[in-house]
Interface confidence: medium
Amino acid sequence: EAHKSEIAHRFKDLGEQHFKGLVLIAFSQYLQKCPYEEHIKLVQEVTDFAKTCVADENAENCDKSIHTLFGDKLCAIPKLRDNYGELADCCAKQEPERNECFLQHKDDNPNLPPFQRPEAEAMCTSFQENPTSFLGHYLHEVARRHPYFYAPELLYYAEKYNEVLTQCCTESDKAACLTPKLDAVKEKALVAAVRQRMKCSSMQRFGERAFKAWAVARMSQRFPNAEFAEITKLATDVTKINKECCHGDLLECADDRAELAKYMCENQATISSKLQACCDKPVLQKSQCLAEIEHDNIPADLPSIAADFVEDKEVCKNYAEAKDVFLGTFLYEYSRRHPDYSVSLLLRLAKKYEATLEKCCAEGDPPACYGTVLAEFQPLVEEPKNLVKTNCELYEKLGEYGFQNAVLVRYTQKAPQVSTPTLVEAARNLGRVGTKCCTLPEAQRLPCVEDYLSAILNRLCVLHEKTPVSEKVTKCCSGSLVERRPCFSALTVDETYVPKEFKAETFTFHSDICTLPDKEKQIKKQTALAELVKHKPKATEDQLKTVMGDFAQFVDKCCKAADKDNCFATEGPNLVARSKEALA
């Protein structure tokens, strides 16, 4: 229904706390360089304005769209051009072009230092002094680094953060309590960030139809007892919600997400038997719980998929009458039977089925032509199954760090032109798939591995798109979203690459490496490994093992030495010489 004042409507629906959090996220995602203090001032102004509109919907400017109100606020910031350059040009445009312009200027890799977690005591002091400001800083810091983070989900993580601090700051050993709990929240949030970026990429590049197909497959897996019309209703709503969040309509997105949770909880009987526990929770936790819900049990009496989609004499007629609905039904029926497949695989199978019908329904004997379609799915299913098997075996053999290094070598050979920091980030994330997925039961491995890899590769594509350097990466990233992972997996050593000059300074290290946290130490070593591969793309596994082992010993030895600086200065050149020799 239409409301006189959109901003008043959202304020009333969301409540002041969530309203303010969402406005802060919106501003932080649009203007990623502004300090917290500047954004919080704008948030307060917008909130005060919303309150006047709640009191009187006819008050001046209350009838303006939220994009107009937010855009006007952002464009009124002094020195906008000095800080943001051409983003200031957006302000010359009218809505909706102005908002589109802001969206295009979102930076997936902003030049911001990594978010450093303060020491436990200091954290607890500032949290206890002003919890609202502390959590506001958290929203701001995460949102500006992840401009597509799913806003209502970020509010949920802020709530989790709050819970952890409330609990741990009363403990005697605050650090022991905080570290593992905050690490767990951080890990979940980082995965959520890449997953949501993938959804926004899907929406931006391929439109709502492609996203809705993804949603139909996902919902059908989770709710196999729901009928097709129910699944499409949920998929339509989820598509709308994600479109809003990806488009910067964060208030509407969060409001609609809460509405969907309410609808699901009111209609559990026609959706799933597993929802009740989620439905007893408060709104943010309820939505998050529903998004992570375990699959319902598959109905016992499902007929073979072949009955409706291969053996039925009316297949071509049904397909011709309403292609989207017929294919949607196929995707639904196949997905509800296969919670053990990744969504990417299910979409590839649906695409194969569509291509088969397009070809066969134009021929003389369609049933004979499409009769073997299900058998033709076999190679498409085997490929990701083999990927999971080989990669999980390698992970089990090498552990996370070793597996990351193996992935780093593989991807540096595939795309040596890509910058080393991007390759290291991608390989570290891809390598985490082992820890995340390989320990799961067999039936959950494939969906976990492939859908996680797809999200990480999407991040690689997004970064590469900004500064394209590898034709092979461009080719894999330009194709369909569901074909990306197989495309990257199929890449081999780039024969066109001219090896990088051996630069001694790339492999020169100093005593500062000794005081780095383990993670930073690993990144230093992995940076050196990528550079080695760029210098010698065809180096054997043994050669790389020798050099990296030598390097690890060198760092270990010098960090234990009495005169660390002297050790690095004298042993360093010897290491470089030995490395050159080993790779010759």
Epitope: E227, F228, A229, E230, T232, K233, T236, Y263, N267, A269, T270, D308, D312, E314, N318, V325, F326, T329, Y332, E333
Partner: nanobody, 119 residues
């Protein structure tokens, strides 16, 4: 016992309009998706439109998109089909049906109402 009773059919000129109704009883209407199907003389059953239990979303066969509108009133247990810009090829017996879990198998449908489009 499930009962579906269609009405509103009749003779109409090409370009004209009709509104079909379907009164439902014997099941919980407001938790069931519903659809309209039709059967032209000498032809097989063709689905026309589907509506979710809540009223949205709705789906249409390509042949009727933009001309037909499906709607429902859950408080009256009634399903509707507004048909505009009617064509000769829309001539058929129209049935309302309770939507099952498989798209192309219909659990229950009524006795139908005949729509004839002719000048």
């Amino acid at each position: 016992e499930v009962q579906l009773l269609e009405s509103g059919g009749g003779l109409v000129q090409p370009g004209g309009s009709l509104r079909l109704s379907c009164a439902a009883s014997g099941f919980t209407f407001d938790t069931s998706s519903m659809l309209w199907v039709r059967q032209a003389p000498g032809k097989g059953l063709e689905w026309v439109s589907v509506i979710h239990q809540s009223g949205t979303p709705t789906y249409y066969a390509d042949s009727v998109k933009g001309r037909f509108t499906i709607s429902r009133d859950n408080s009256k247990n009634t399903l509707y089909l507004q048909m505009n810009s009617l064509r000769a090829e829309d001539t058929a017996v129209y049935y309302c049906a309770k939507f099952p879990s498989s798209q192309f198998r219909f659990d229950y449908w009524g006795q139908g109402t005949l729509v004839t489009v002719s000048s």
